[in-house]
Protein backbone atom coordinates (compact mmCIF):
# COMPACT_ATOMS: atom_id res chain seq x y z
CA UNK A 1 0.00 0.00 0.00
CA UNK A 2 1.32 3.55 -0.87
CA UNK A 3 2.54 5.65 2.02
CA UNK A 4 0.28 8.55 3.05
CA UNK A 5 0.94 11.87 1.30
CA UNK A 6 -0.06 15.28 2.67
CA UNK A 7 -1.23 17.42 -0.23
CA UNK A 8 -1.45 21.20 0.05
CA UNK A 9 -2.53 22.03 -3.53
CA UNK A 10 -1.97 25.81 -3.35
CA UNK A 11 1.57 27.10 -2.98
CA UNK A 12 0.15 30.52 -2.14
CA UNK A 13 -3.13 32.18 -1.21
CA UNK A 14 -3.80 35.92 -1.16
CA UNK A 15 -6.60 37.35 0.99
CA UNK A 16 -7.88 40.85 1.70
CA UNK A 17 -7.69 41.98 5.32
CA UNK A 18 -10.98 41.26 7.10
CA UNK A 19 -11.86 38.32 4.86
CA UNK A 20 -11.54 34.60 5.57
CA UNK A 21 -8.66 32.50 4.24
CA UNK A 22 -9.22 28.90 3.18
CA UNK A 23 -6.13 26.71 3.43
CA UNK A 24 -6.59 23.41 1.66
CA UNK A 25 -5.11 20.10 2.76
CA UNK A 26 -5.90 16.51 1.81
CA UNK A 27 -4.50 13.11 2.81
CA UNK A 28 -4.10 10.25 0.38
CA UNK A 29 -4.72 7.58 3.02
CA UNK A 30 -6.44 6.94 6.35
CA UNK A 31 -3.35 5.15 7.66
CA UNK A 32 -1.54 5.67 9.96
CA UNK A 33 -4.13 6.60 12.54
CA UNK A 34 -3.51 9.91 14.26
CA UNK A 35 -4.52 13.57 14.31
CA UNK A 36 -3.59 16.41 11.98
CA UNK A 37 -2.39 19.83 13.07
CA UNK A 38 -1.90 23.11 11.28
CA UNK A 39 1.15 25.28 12.02
CA UNK A 40 2.38 28.63 10.87
CA UNK A 41 6.09 28.49 10.16
CA UNK A 42 8.44 25.55 10.46
CA UNK A 43 10.99 24.33 12.99
CA UNK A 44 11.07 24.75 16.74
CA UNK A 45 9.43 28.19 16.75
CA UNK A 46 6.38 27.21 14.72
CA UNK A 47 2.97 28.42 15.92
CA UNK A 48 0.07 26.02 16.40
CA UNK A 49 -2.96 27.21 14.44
CA UNK A 50 -5.26 24.21 14.79
CA UNK A 51 -5.17 20.85 16.52
CA UNK A 52 -7.76 18.29 15.45
CA UNK A 53 -7.46 16.45 18.77
CA UNK A 54 -7.75 19.21 21.35
CA UNK A 55 -7.74 22.93 22.07
CA UNK A 56 -9.88 25.99 21.41
CA UNK A 57 -9.32 27.81 18.11
CA UNK A 58 -12.12 30.40 17.78
CA UNK A 59 -11.04 31.80 14.40
CA UNK A 60 -10.56 28.41 12.76
CA UNK A 61 -13.29 26.26 11.24
CA UNK A 62 -12.83 23.04 9.33
CA UNK A 63 -14.17 22.88 5.82
CA UNK A 64 -15.22 19.20 6.18
CA UNK A 65 -16.58 17.26 9.12
CA UNK A 66 -13.30 15.79 10.38
CA UNK A 67 -14.99 13.15 12.53
CA UNK A 68 -16.82 11.78 9.50
CA UNK A 69 -15.78 8.24 8.58
CA UNK A 70 -13.21 8.05 5.74
CA UNK A 71 -12.68 11.83 5.73
CA UNK A 72 -9.48 12.82 3.91
CA UNK A 73 -10.10 16.58 3.68
CA UNK A 74 -8.39 18.59 6.42
CA UNK A 75 -8.80 22.06 4.93
CA UNK A 76 -9.38 24.93 7.34
CA UNK A 77 -10.79 28.45 7.12
CA UNK A 78 -9.35 31.27 9.25
CA UNK A 79 -11.73 34.20 9.78
CA UNK A 80 -11.08 37.95 10.00
CA UNK A 81 -7.60 37.85 8.51
CA UNK A 82 -5.18 40.65 9.43
CA UNK A 83 -1.67 41.38 8.08
CA UNK A 84 -0.28 39.68 11.20
CA UNK A 85 -1.64 36.35 9.88
CA UNK A 86 0.69 36.36 6.87
CA UNK A 87 3.14 33.46 6.68
CA UNK A 88 3.53 29.88 5.50
CA UNK A 89 1.02 27.38 6.86
CA UNK A 90 1.80 23.68 7.12
CA UNK A 91 -0.69 20.84 7.37
CA UNK A 92 1.02 18.12 9.45
CA UNK A 93 -0.07 14.50 9.98
CA UNK A 94 0.78 12.88 13.33
CA UNK A 95 0.92 9.16 14.10
CA UNK A 96 -0.84 8.03 17.27
CA UNK A 97 1.75 7.32 19.93
CA UNK A 98 2.24 6.90 23.64
CA UNK A 99 2.55 9.02 25.60
CA UNK A 100 2.72 11.61 22.76
CA UNK A 101 1.74 11.54 19.12
CA UNK A 102 4.67 11.61 16.70
CA UNK A 103 4.95 13.84 13.64
CA UNK A 104 4.62 11.64 10.59
CA UNK A 105 4.50 13.85 7.50
CA UNK A 106 4.08 17.52 6.58
CA UNK A 107 2.58 19.16 3.57
CA UNK A 108 4.71 21.41 1.38
CA UNK A 109 3.15 24.53 2.92
CA UNK A 110 0.84 27.29 1.66
CA UNK A 111 2.04 30.86 1.84
CA UNK A 112 -0.71 33.20 2.99
CA UNK A 113 -0.26 36.79 1.93
CA UNK A 114 -2.63 39.41 3.23
CA UNK A 115 -3.68 42.38 1.17
CA UNK A 116 -4.33 45.40 3.38
CA UNK A 117 -5.35 48.88 2.32
CA UNK A 118 -3.07 51.82 3.00
CA UNK A 119 -4.36 54.38 5.50
CA UNK A 120 -5.52 57.76 4.19
CA UNK A 121 -2.39 59.73 3.32
CA UNK A 122 -1.57 62.58 5.68
CA UNK A 123 0.18 65.56 4.11
CA UNK A 124 2.05 68.07 6.25
CA UNK A 125 3.83 71.24 5.24
CA UNK A 126 6.68 73.34 6.61
CA UNK A 127 6.62 74.62 10.19
CA UNK A 128 7.38 78.21 9.11
CA UNK A 129 6.16 80.23 6.16
CA UNK A 130 8.45 80.99 3.24
CA UNK A 131 8.33 83.68 0.58
CA UNK A 132 7.89 83.23 -3.19
CA UNK A 133 10.88 81.81 -5.10
CA UNK A 134 11.88 79.76 -2.03
CA UNK A 135 11.59 75.98 -1.86
CA UNK A 136 9.50 74.32 0.83
CA UNK A 137 9.06 70.65 1.69
CA UNK A 138 5.83 68.72 2.08
CA UNK A 139 5.66 65.22 3.50
CA UNK A 140 3.11 62.48 2.86
CA UNK A 141 2.68 59.38 4.99
CA UNK A 142 0.52 56.27 4.79
CA UNK A 143 0.66 53.07 6.80
CA UNK A 144 -0.54 49.52 7.20
CA UNK A 145 -0.60 48.32 3.61
CA UNK A 146 0.35 44.99 2.09
CA UNK A 147 1.74 43.88 -0.32
CA UNK A 148 4.70 46.25 -0.43
CA UNK A 149 4.24 47.40 -4.03
CA UNK A 150 2.71 50.89 -4.03
CA UNK A 151 2.70 53.99 -6.24
CA UNK A 152 2.89 57.54 -4.91
CA UNK A 153 2.50 60.71 -6.97
CA UNK A 154 2.53 64.42 -6.11
CA UNK A 155 0.49 67.10 -7.86
CA UNK A 156 0.36 70.87 -7.70
CA UNK A 157 -2.05 73.01 -9.71
CA UNK A 158 -2.85 70.44 -12.36
CA UNK A 159 0.75 69.32 -12.79
CA UNK A 160 2.54 66.25 -11.59
CA UNK A 161 5.60 67.06 -9.49
CA UNK A 162 8.91 65.30 -10.09
CA UNK A 163 11.10 66.61 -7.26
CA UNK A 164 10.30 64.15 -4.49
CA UNK A 165 11.84 61.25 -2.61
CA UNK A 166 9.88 58.23 -1.42
CA UNK A 167 10.73 55.43 0.99
CA UNK A 168 8.76 52.29 1.76
CA UNK A 169 9.60 50.71 5.13
CA UNK A 170 10.70 48.24 6.21
CA UNK A 171 13.05 47.24 3.40
CA UNK A 172 12.69 43.52 4.11
CA UNK A 173 9.67 41.24 4.46
CA UNK A 174 6.99 42.42 6.85
CA UNK A 175 3.32 41.84 7.62
CA UNK A 176 2.58 45.44 6.58
CA UNK A 177 4.40 48.49 5.25
CA UNK A 178 4.55 52.26 5.51
CA UNK A 179 5.37 54.88 2.90
CA UNK A 180 6.96 58.28 3.48
CA UNK A 181 7.52 60.81 0.73
CA UNK A 182 8.97 64.33 0.75
CA UNK A 183 8.25 66.71 -2.13
CA UNK A 184 10.09 69.97 -2.74
CA UNK A 185 7.91 72.79 -4.04
CA UNK A 186 9.08 76.15 -5.31
CA UNK A 187 6.61 78.81 -4.15
CA UNK A 188 5.26 81.44 -6.54
CA UNK A 189 3.34 84.63 -5.75
CA UNK A 190 0.12 83.04 -6.99
CA UNK A 191 0.29 80.06 -4.62
CA UNK A 192 -2.09 81.36 -1.95
CA UNK A 193 -4.90 79.39 -3.61
CA UNK A 194 -2.68 76.43 -4.58
CA UNK A 195 -2.85 72.91 -3.21
CA UNK A 196 -0.40 70.06 -3.17
CA UNK A 197 -1.90 66.59 -3.49
CA UNK A 198 -0.30 63.30 -2.53
CA UNK A 199 -1.90 60.37 -4.35
CA UNK A 200 -1.43 56.74 -3.39
CA UNK A 201 -2.30 53.80 -5.62
CA UNK A 202 -2.29 50.24 -4.31
CA UNK A 203 -3.70 46.98 -5.60
CA UNK A 204 -6.27 46.90 -2.78
CA UNK A 205 -7.70 50.25 -3.90
CA UNK A 206 -8.16 49.32 -7.56
CA UNK A 207 -10.49 51.92 -9.07
CA UNK A 208 -9.95 54.84 -6.72
CA UNK A 209 -6.65 56.08 -5.32
CA UNK A 210 -6.30 57.69 -1.91
CA UNK A 211 -5.41 61.37 -1.78
CA UNK A 212 -4.20 63.74 0.88
CA UNK A 213 -3.99 67.49 0.39
CA UNK A 214 -2.27 70.48 1.90
CA UNK A 215 -2.94 74.13 1.16
CA UNK A 216 0.02 76.26 0.21
CA UNK A 217 -1.70 79.15 1.97
CA UNK A 218 -0.38 77.57 5.19
CA UNK A 219 3.18 77.61 3.86
CA UNK A 220 3.50 80.90 2.01
CA UNK A 221 4.11 84.48 3.06
CA UNK A 222 3.80 87.10 0.34
CA UNK A 223 5.42 90.35 1.58
CA UNK A 224 3.58 93.57 0.77
CA UNK A 225 4.61 96.25 -1.69
CA UNK A 226 4.24 99.81 -0.37
CA UNK A 227 3.43 102.97 -2.26
CA UNK A 228 3.05 106.39 -0.62
CA UNK A 229 1.41 109.13 -2.70
CA UNK A 230 -0.09 112.57 -2.20
CA UNK A 231 -3.65 113.01 -3.37
CA UNK A 232 -4.92 116.39 -4.66
CA UNK A 233 -6.99 118.34 -2.10
CA UNK A 234 -9.58 121.08 -2.50
CA UNK A 235 -8.41 123.00 0.55
CA UNK A 236 -5.09 124.74 -0.06
CA UNK A 237 -3.84 124.20 3.49
CA UNK A 238 -4.45 120.40 3.61
CA UNK A 239 -2.49 117.49 2.18
CA UNK A 240 -3.87 113.96 1.78
CA UNK A 241 -1.10 111.35 1.89
CA UNK A 242 -2.02 107.70 1.28
CA UNK A 243 -0.12 104.51 1.88
CA UNK A 244 -1.19 101.68 -0.40
CA UNK A 245 -0.12 98.28 0.95
CA UNK A 246 -0.55 95.74 -1.84
CA UNK A 247 -0.52 91.99 -2.50
CA UNK A 248 0.34 90.58 0.90
CA UNK A 249 -0.51 87.29 2.60
CA UNK A 250 -1.44 86.34 5.29
CA UNK A 251 -3.57 89.23 6.47
CA UNK A 252 -1.77 90.00 9.77
CA UNK A 253 -0.55 93.60 9.37
CA UNK A 254 0.37 96.57 11.59
CA UNK A 255 0.70 99.97 9.94
CA UNK A 256 2.37 103.00 11.58
CA UNK A 257 2.82 106.52 10.27
CA UNK A 258 6.04 108.35 11.16
CA UNK A 259 6.46 112.12 10.86
CA UNK A 260 10.10 113.11 10.53
CA UNK A 261 10.98 109.83 12.22
CA UNK A 262 8.56 110.14 15.12
CA UNK A 263 5.46 108.01 15.55
CA UNK A 264 2.54 110.04 14.41
CA UNK A 265 -0.27 107.53 14.47
CA UNK A 266 -0.70 103.76 14.31
CA UNK A 267 -3.12 103.27 11.48
CA UNK A 268 -5.43 100.46 10.50
CA UNK A 269 -7.92 102.48 8.54
CA UNK A 270 -9.55 101.56 5.22
CA UNK A 271 -11.06 98.27 4.18
CA UNK A 272 -9.15 95.07 3.62
CA UNK A 273 -9.59 93.98 0.01
CA UNK A 274 -8.98 90.39 -1.10
CA UNK A 275 -7.48 90.04 -4.57
CA UNK A 276 -8.30 87.28 -7.06
CA UNK A 277 -5.04 85.49 -6.26
CA UNK A 278 -5.87 85.38 -2.52
CA UNK A 279 -3.50 88.16 -1.48
CA UNK A 280 -4.77 91.31 0.25
CA UNK A 281 -4.62 95.06 -0.27
CA UNK A 282 -4.89 97.69 2.47
CA UNK A 283 -4.89 101.47 2.36
CA UNK A 284 -4.30 104.07 5.05
CA UNK A 285 -4.26 107.81 4.68
CA UNK A 286 -3.49 110.97 6.60
CA UNK A 287 -4.94 114.45 6.27
CA UNK A 288 -2.09 116.82 7.11
CA UNK A 289 -2.73 120.49 7.96
CA UNK A 290 0.15 122.08 6.07
CA UNK A 291 -0.33 125.41 7.85
CA UNK A 292 1.06 123.79 10.96
CA UNK A 293 4.49 123.23 9.40
CA UNK A 294 7.32 125.72 8.97
CA UNK A 295 9.57 123.13 7.27
CA UNK A 296 9.16 120.30 4.83
CA UNK A 297 7.82 117.06 6.39
CA UNK A 298 8.98 113.50 5.70
CA UNK A 299 6.03 111.15 6.17
CA UNK A 300 6.90 107.46 6.49
CA UNK A 301 4.48 104.55 6.19
CA UNK A 302 5.89 101.65 8.19
CA UNK A 303 4.39 98.20 7.89
CA UNK A 304 5.03 95.12 10.00
CA UNK A 305 3.66 92.05 8.24
CA UNK A 306 3.15 88.62 9.79
CA UNK A 307 5.65 89.29 12.58
CA UNK A 308 8.45 90.06 10.13
CA UNK A 309 10.86 93.00 10.23
CA UNK A 310 9.08 96.24 9.36
CA UNK A 311 9.31 97.67 5.84
CA UNK A 312 8.73 101.33 5.12
CA UNK A 313 8.25 103.87 2.37
CA UNK A 314 8.71 107.64 2.82
CA UNK A 315 7.24 110.67 1.15
CA UNK A 316 8.59 114.23 1.39
CA UNK A 317 5.78 116.72 1.81
CA UNK A 318 6.93 120.14 0.60
CA UNK A 319 5.65 123.14 2.55
CA UNK A 320 5.36 126.29 0.41
CA UNK A 321 7.02 129.53 1.58
CA UNK A 322 3.56 131.16 1.99
CA UNK A 323 2.42 128.37 4.35
CA UNK A 324 5.65 128.52 6.36
CA UNK A 325 4.85 132.14 7.28
CA UNK A 326 1.35 131.32 8.55
CA UNK A 327 2.11 128.25 10.63
CA UNK A 328 -0.06 126.85 13.40
CA UNK A 329 -0.34 123.59 15.38
CA UNK A 330 -0.29 120.29 13.41
CA UNK A 331 -3.43 118.19 13.22
CA UNK A 332 -3.59 114.67 11.85
CA UNK A 333 -6.90 113.32 10.74
CA UNK A 334 -7.56 109.72 9.73
CA UNK A 335 -10.24 109.46 7.11
CA UNK A 336 -11.71 106.50 8.96
CA UNK A 337 -11.64 105.74 12.65
CA UNK A 338 -8.75 103.38 13.36
CA UNK A 339 -9.53 99.76 14.14
CA UNK A 340 -7.49 97.01 15.77
CA UNK A 341 -4.44 95.82 13.83
CA UNK A 342 -5.15 93.21 11.18
Amino acid sequence: EDELQVIQPEKSVSVAAGESATLRCAMTSLIPVGPIMWFRGAGAGRELIYNQKEGHFPRVTTVSELTKRNNLDFSISISNITPADAGTYYCVKFRKGSPDDVEFKSGAGTELSVRAKPSAPVVSGPAVRATPEHTVSFTCESHGFSPRDITLKWFKNGNELSDFQTNVDPAGDSVSYSIHSTARVVLTRGDVHSQVICEIAHITLQGDPLRGTANLSEAIRVPPTLEVTQQPMRAENQANVTCQVSNFYPRGLQLTWLENGNVSRTETASTLIENKDGTYNWMSWLLVNTCAHRDDVVLTCQVEHDGQQAVSKSYALEISAHQKEHGSDITHEAALAPTAPL
Epitope: T151, H202, I203, T204, Q206, D208
Partner: antibody, heavy 120, light 107 residues
Framework: QIQLVQSGPELKKPGETVKISCKAS????????MHWVKQAPGKGLKWMGW????????TYAEDFKGRFAFFLETSASTAYLQINNVKNEDTATYFC?????????????WGQGTSVIVSS | DIQMTQSSSSFSVSLGDRVTITCKAS??????LAWYQQKPGNAPRLLIS???SLETGVPSRFSGSGSGKDYTLSITSLQTEDVATYYC?????????FGGGTKLEIK
Amino acid sequence: QIQLVQSGPELKKPGETVKISCKASGYTFTDYAMHWVKQAPGKGLKWMGWKNTETGESTYAEDFKGRFAFFLETSASTAYLQINNVKNEDTATYFCARGGYGSNYVMDYWGQGTSVIVSS
Amino acid sequence: DIQMTQSSSSFSVSLGDRVTITCKASEDIYNRLAWYQQKPGNAPRLLISGATSLETGVPSRFSGSGSGKDYTLSITSLQTEDVATYYCQQYWNSPRTFGGGTKLEIK
Protein backbone atom coordinates in the same frame (compact mmCIF):
# COMPACT_ATOMS: atom_id res chain seq x y z
CA GLN B 1 -5.69 38.05 -24.78
CA ILE B 2 -7.87 40.10 -22.47
CA GLN B 3 -11.59 39.68 -23.04
CA LEU B 4 -14.84 40.64 -21.34
CA VAL B 5 -17.81 38.63 -22.59
CA GLN B 6 -21.30 39.72 -21.57
CA SER B 7 -24.55 37.76 -21.47
CA GLY B 8 -27.17 38.07 -24.19
CA PRO B 9 -30.04 40.55 -24.67
CA GLU B 10 -32.89 40.72 -22.17
CA LEU B 11 -36.57 41.61 -22.62
CA LYS B 12 -38.28 42.39 -19.32
CA LYS B 13 -41.60 43.67 -18.07
CA PRO B 14 -41.70 46.60 -15.62
CA GLY B 15 -41.20 45.40 -12.05
CA GLU B 16 -39.12 42.36 -12.99
CA THR B 17 -35.44 41.76 -12.18
CA VAL B 18 -32.63 41.49 -14.70
CA LYS B 19 -29.15 40.10 -14.08
CA ILE B 20 -26.35 40.68 -16.60
CA SER B 21 -23.07 38.75 -16.46
CA CYS B 22 -19.60 39.79 -17.57
CA LYS B 23 -17.00 37.02 -17.79
CA ALA B 24 -13.36 38.11 -17.75
CA SER B 25 -10.42 36.20 -19.20
CA GLY B 26 -6.77 36.83 -20.04
CA TYR B 27 -5.83 38.54 -16.75
CA THR B 28 -6.04 38.07 -12.98
CA PHE B 29 -9.64 39.00 -12.26
CA THR B 30 -9.10 40.21 -8.68
CA ASP B 31 -6.30 42.63 -9.67
CA TYR B 32 -8.57 45.05 -11.54
CA ALA B 33 -11.75 46.95 -10.84
CA MET B 34 -14.91 46.29 -12.83
CA HIS B 35 -16.94 49.31 -13.96
CA TRP B 36 -20.47 49.42 -15.37
CA VAL B 37 -21.65 51.95 -17.95
CA LYS B 38 -25.16 52.62 -19.28
CA GLN B 39 -26.02 53.85 -22.76
CA ALA B 40 -29.67 54.64 -23.44
CA PRO B 41 -30.80 54.41 -27.10
CA GLY B 42 -29.30 57.29 -29.11
CA LYS B 43 -27.68 58.76 -25.99
CA GLY B 44 -24.21 59.11 -24.54
CA LEU B 45 -22.32 57.04 -22.00
CA LYS B 46 -23.19 57.21 -18.31
CA TRP B 47 -20.97 55.75 -15.59
CA MET B 48 -22.94 53.65 -13.10
CA GLY B 49 -20.21 52.74 -10.64
CA TRP B 50 -17.58 50.11 -9.98
CA LYS B 51 -16.83 46.96 -8.03
CA ASN B 52 -13.58 46.34 -6.19
CA THR B 53 -12.95 42.74 -7.23
CA GLU B 54 -10.39 42.30 -4.44
CA THR B 55 -12.45 43.48 -1.47
CA GLY B 56 -15.97 43.16 -2.89
CA GLU B 57 -16.81 46.81 -2.14
CA SER B 58 -19.25 48.53 -4.50
CA THR B 59 -19.35 52.22 -5.40
CA TYR B 60 -22.50 53.54 -7.10
CA ALA B 61 -23.08 56.83 -8.92
CA GLU B 62 -25.91 58.85 -7.38
CA ASP B 63 -28.44 57.95 -10.11
CA PHE B 64 -27.82 54.22 -9.61
CA LYS B 65 -28.25 53.89 -5.86
CA GLY B 66 -31.12 51.68 -4.74
CA ARG B 67 -32.32 49.33 -7.48
CA PHE B 68 -28.89 48.52 -8.90
CA ALA B 69 -26.41 46.02 -7.47
CA PHE B 70 -22.99 44.74 -8.49
CA PHE B 71 -22.04 41.15 -7.64
CA LEU B 72 -19.01 38.94 -8.14
CA GLU B 73 -18.38 35.27 -8.65
CA THR B 74 -14.63 35.41 -8.19
CA SER B 75 -14.04 31.70 -8.77
CA ALA B 76 -15.60 32.09 -12.23
CA SER B 77 -13.94 35.50 -12.94
CA THR B 78 -17.41 36.91 -13.48
CA ALA B 79 -19.03 40.19 -12.50
CA TYR B 80 -22.78 40.76 -12.46
CA LEU B 81 -25.07 43.75 -12.71
CA GLN B 82 -28.52 43.24 -11.25
CA ILE B 83 -31.38 45.70 -11.76
CA ASN B 84 -34.38 45.19 -9.51
CA ASN B 85 -37.91 46.41 -10.19
CA VAL B 86 -37.00 47.46 -13.74
CA LYS B 87 -38.57 50.57 -15.25
CA ASN B 88 -39.02 51.73 -18.85
CA GLU B 89 -36.13 54.19 -18.41
CA ASP B 90 -33.78 51.25 -17.74
CA THR B 91 -34.05 50.35 -21.43
CA ALA B 92 -30.42 50.66 -22.56
CA THR B 93 -27.25 48.83 -23.45
CA TYR B 94 -25.11 48.07 -20.40
CA PHE B 95 -21.34 47.68 -20.66
CA CYS B 96 -18.84 46.24 -18.21
CA ALA B 97 -15.33 47.66 -18.43
CA ARG B 98 -12.09 46.78 -16.71
CA GLY B 99 -10.45 49.57 -14.70
CA GLY B 100 -6.71 49.91 -14.38
CA TYR B 101 -4.80 50.96 -11.30
CA GLY B 102 -1.42 52.46 -10.42
CA SER B 103 -1.12 55.61 -12.43
CA ASN B 104 -3.95 54.80 -14.77
CA TYR B 105 -7.53 54.32 -13.60
CA VAL B 106 -8.87 54.37 -17.13
CA MET B 107 -11.38 51.81 -18.45
CA ASP B 108 -9.14 49.97 -20.87
CA TYR B 109 -11.12 46.88 -21.93
CA TRP B 110 -14.89 46.75 -22.52
CA GLY B 111 -17.49 44.03 -22.87
CA GLN B 112 -19.57 43.96 -26.06
CA GLY B 113 -22.62 45.29 -24.23
CA THR B 114 -25.93 43.74 -23.18
CA SER B 115 -29.17 45.20 -24.50
CA VAL B 116 -32.00 45.41 -21.98
CA ILE B 117 -35.47 46.30 -23.18
CA VAL B 118 -38.18 47.02 -20.64
CA SER B 119 -41.66 46.94 -22.10
CA SER B 120 -45.10 46.00 -20.86
CA ASP C 1 -19.45 66.20 -9.68
CA ILE C 2 -17.05 67.19 -12.44
CA GLN C 3 -18.90 68.22 -15.61
CA MET C 4 -17.33 67.36 -18.96
CA THR C 5 -18.38 69.50 -21.91
CA GLN C 6 -17.80 68.64 -25.56
CA SER C 7 -18.82 71.86 -27.27
CA SER C 8 -19.75 70.27 -30.62
CA SER C 9 -22.19 67.37 -30.64
CA SER C 10 -21.51 66.69 -34.33
CA PHE C 11 -19.07 67.66 -37.07
CA SER C 12 -19.49 67.39 -40.81
CA VAL C 13 -16.04 66.66 -42.22
CA SER C 14 -14.32 65.57 -45.41
CA LEU C 15 -11.95 62.63 -45.75
CA GLY C 16 -8.35 63.78 -45.33
CA ASP C 17 -9.37 66.74 -43.12
CA ARG C 18 -7.64 67.55 -39.88
CA VAL C 19 -10.22 67.23 -37.10
CA THR C 20 -10.03 68.74 -33.63
CA ILE C 21 -12.49 67.77 -30.88
CA THR C 22 -12.43 69.74 -27.65
CA CYS C 23 -13.41 68.77 -24.12
CA LYS C 24 -13.64 71.08 -21.12
CA ALA C 25 -13.80 69.97 -17.48
CA SER C 26 -15.57 72.04 -14.83
CA GLU C 27 -12.46 71.78 -12.63
CA ASP C 28 -8.85 70.69 -12.84
CA ILE C 29 -8.60 66.97 -13.66
CA TYR C 30 -4.80 66.70 -13.55
CA ASN C 31 -4.53 65.10 -17.02
CA ARG C 32 -6.66 62.13 -15.95
CA LEU C 33 -8.55 62.22 -19.21
CA ALA C 34 -9.43 59.42 -21.63
CA TRP C 35 -10.74 59.58 -25.19
CA TYR C 36 -12.98 56.78 -26.52
CA GLN C 37 -14.16 55.98 -30.02
CA GLN C 38 -17.55 54.32 -30.46
CA LYS C 39 -18.97 53.03 -33.72
CA PRO C 40 -22.69 52.21 -34.02
CA GLY C 41 -23.57 48.89 -32.39
CA ASN C 42 -20.12 48.51 -30.83
CA ALA C 43 -18.57 49.01 -27.42
CA PRO C 44 -16.41 52.09 -26.84
CA ARG C 45 -12.72 51.65 -27.64
CA LEU C 46 -10.03 53.39 -25.60
CA LEU C 47 -7.85 55.61 -27.81
CA ILE C 48 -5.96 57.84 -25.39
CA SER C 49 -5.36 57.85 -21.65
CA GLY C 50 -3.60 60.35 -19.43
CA ALA C 51 -4.67 63.09 -21.90
CA THR C 52 -1.79 62.33 -24.29
CA SER C 53 -0.82 58.62 -24.21
CA LEU C 54 -1.87 56.71 -27.31
CA GLU C 55 -3.05 53.15 -26.57
CA THR C 56 -1.37 50.21 -28.30
CA GLY C 57 -2.76 49.62 -31.78
CA VAL C 58 -4.27 53.10 -32.18
CA PRO C 59 -3.12 54.79 -35.42
CA SER C 60 -0.60 57.60 -35.01
CA ARG C 61 -2.92 60.07 -36.78
CA PHE C 62 -4.73 60.32 -33.41
CA SER C 63 -3.22 62.52 -30.73
CA GLY C 64 -4.30 64.08 -27.47
CA SER C 65 -3.22 67.30 -25.81
CA GLY C 66 -4.21 69.66 -23.03
CA SER C 67 -3.90 70.11 -19.30
CA GLY C 68 -5.83 71.54 -16.37
CA LYS C 69 -9.43 71.87 -17.57
CA ASP C 70 -8.99 71.99 -21.37
CA TYR C 71 -8.26 68.98 -23.58
CA THR C 72 -8.19 68.21 -27.28
CA LEU C 73 -8.33 65.12 -29.48
CA SER C 74 -6.85 65.60 -32.95
CA ILE C 75 -7.04 63.43 -36.06
CA THR C 76 -4.48 64.62 -38.62
CA SER C 77 -6.02 63.12 -41.76
CA LEU C 78 -9.50 61.68 -41.39
CA GLN C 79 -10.02 58.17 -42.77
CA THR C 80 -13.32 56.39 -43.51
CA GLU C 81 -12.86 54.10 -40.50
CA ASP C 82 -12.63 57.15 -38.19
CA VAL C 83 -16.30 57.99 -38.69
CA ALA C 84 -17.66 57.42 -35.18
CA THR C 85 -18.70 59.19 -31.99
CA TYR C 86 -15.88 60.33 -29.72
CA TYR C 87 -16.26 60.68 -25.95
CA CYS C 88 -13.96 62.25 -23.41
CA GLN C 89 -14.05 61.01 -19.83
CA GLN C 90 -12.39 62.18 -16.64
CA TYR C 91 -11.10 59.66 -14.13
CA TRP C 92 -9.64 62.05 -11.59
CA ASN C 93 -12.66 61.81 -9.28
CA SER C 94 -15.70 59.65 -8.66
CA PRO C 95 -18.21 59.74 -10.16
CA ARG C 96 -16.39 59.22 -13.43
CA THR C 97 -18.04 61.49 -15.97
CA PHE C 98 -18.21 61.45 -19.75
CA GLY C 99 -18.60 64.30 -22.18
CA GLY C 100 -21.78 64.28 -24.28
CA GLY C 101 -19.95 62.91 -27.31
CA THR C 102 -18.97 64.37 -30.70
CA LYS C 103 -20.25 62.57 -33.78
CA LEU C 104 -18.15 62.77 -36.95
CA GLU C 105 -20.09 62.59 -40.21
CA ILE C 106 -18.82 62.69 -43.78
CA LYS C 107 -19.89 65.69 -45.86
